[in-house]
Interface confidence: medium
Amino acid sequence: DSEEDEEHTIITDTELPPLKLMHSFCAFKADDGPCKAIMKRFFFNIFTRQCEEFIYGGCEGNQNRFESLEECKKMCTRDNANRIIKTTLQQEKPDFCFLEEDPGICRGYITRYFYNNQTKQCERFKYGGCLGNMNNFETLEECKNICEDGGGSGGGLNDIFEAQKIEWHEGGPPHHHHHHHHHH
């Protein structure tokens, strides 16, 4: 099977409807990183829908990486994770949508967008350019698609999977909440 076929299956397979993820990073592919260490780690496999072992090189990589099987399960599966979820059910927002705006500690002051759980809307804020949290989007549209009710083409995860499909095709995992660029 080609990777494209597998990606296609994630979105359209009628026997396994869209997966209800607790965190969008659980959809990232296992990434061993460029370093050469041999470290046993665990990642959530969206195809098998379970946590699996992989070898991590010791640097970089992505957030879909856990030191223990238990930690992986806690972050990426629910107690009822394997139940069938009808696509007509409203998708839950990722947990990070409920984090407060966090400018971080640096002083770059870049315009970003976050989901304000009080107003239930995406709003602009000034991001310092480092640290902070995942409730941090480069565009208003991106924030709305992922965190607002009824945003985008049917709420949250569809958009994450669509983005993932495109970005995997281009050779890299999605990093919608990591694009903390400085603009000088």
């Epitope: 970089e60 992505n62 957030q63 400018p103 640096c106 480092c130 694009h179 903390h180 660029h181």
Partner: antibody, heavy 118, light 113 residues
């Protein structure tokens, strides 16, 4: 004149706890994020933790997450690092530093040595 | 292994120009994050030398200059002096994983006698 003075270091057994303090003077403490950075003997620098000026946001390196807690008391101009479940690899000189321009640490304390050994 | 890579050691004669390199990746320097440089004299705390790629804090001589391009950065020291003998560290932010402030492994600069 900006001054940062660390204290609280010492010898502790593996699994033990220690609380470091950093007394700040010469600048408006509550306006600055603060960090702890450590340096193992003969090794390079490693960022440990940071806290926003208000104390509302905290950040940790993966190597200390769940074991160390950073906090601050702006009324006392003091930064703290509570270190639990200490390991031999936590042995280092611990520096406190204030985050000023860009992502830089403008000023550093003289450091306090933490030795974890049985 | 450090996220940012520096040569472990360099040396130069007094009056010479030396350049210390710092190589990162697409998740730190290549993602347009600023680089800082620190000087650590033997037995002392680090001191900020360059911030925001190429800015000097007041009190730092203009013999020190910094630059960043793509996934690399460099610190240049002209008119090398005996008191420049120290360890030099580059530092930036890395957006991969949970996000972290990262350092190079340090470069020991020796001024030849």
């Amino acid at each position: 004149e900006v001054q940062l003075v660390e204290s609280g270091g010492g010898l502790v057994q593996p699994g033990g706890s220690l609380r470091l303090s950093c007394a700040a003077s010469g600048f408006t403490f509550s306006s600055y994020a603060m960090s702890w950075v450590r340096q193992a003997p003969g090794k390079g620098l490693e960022w440990v933790s940071a806290i926003s000026g208000s104390g509302g946001s905290t950040y940790y390196a993966d190597s200390v997450k769940g074991r160390f807690t950073i906090s601050r008391d702006n009324s006392k101009n003091t930064l703290y690092l509570q270190m639990n479940s200490l390991r031999a690899e936590d042995t280092a000189v611990y520096y406190c530093a204030n985050n000023g321009a860009a992502a830089a640490w403008d000023y550093w304390g003289q450091g306090t040595l933490v030795t974890v050994s049985s | 292994q450090s996220v940012l890579t520096q040569p472990p050691s360099l040396s130069g004669a007094p009056g010479q120009r030396v350049t210390i390199s710092c190589t990162g990746s697409s998740s730190n320097l290549g993602a347009d994050y600023d680089v800082q440089w620190y000087q650590q004299l033997p037995g002392t705390a680090p001191k900020l030398l360059i911030f925001g790629n190429n800015n000097r804090p007041s009190g730092v001589p203009d013999r020190f200059s910094g630059s960043r391009s793509g996934t690399s950065a460099s610190l240049a020291i002209t008119g090398l002096q005996a008191e420049d003998e120290a360890n030099y560290y580059c530092q930036s932010y890395d957006r991969s994983l949970s996000g972290s402030m990262v350092f190079g492994g340090g470069t020991k600069l020796t001024v030849l006698g």
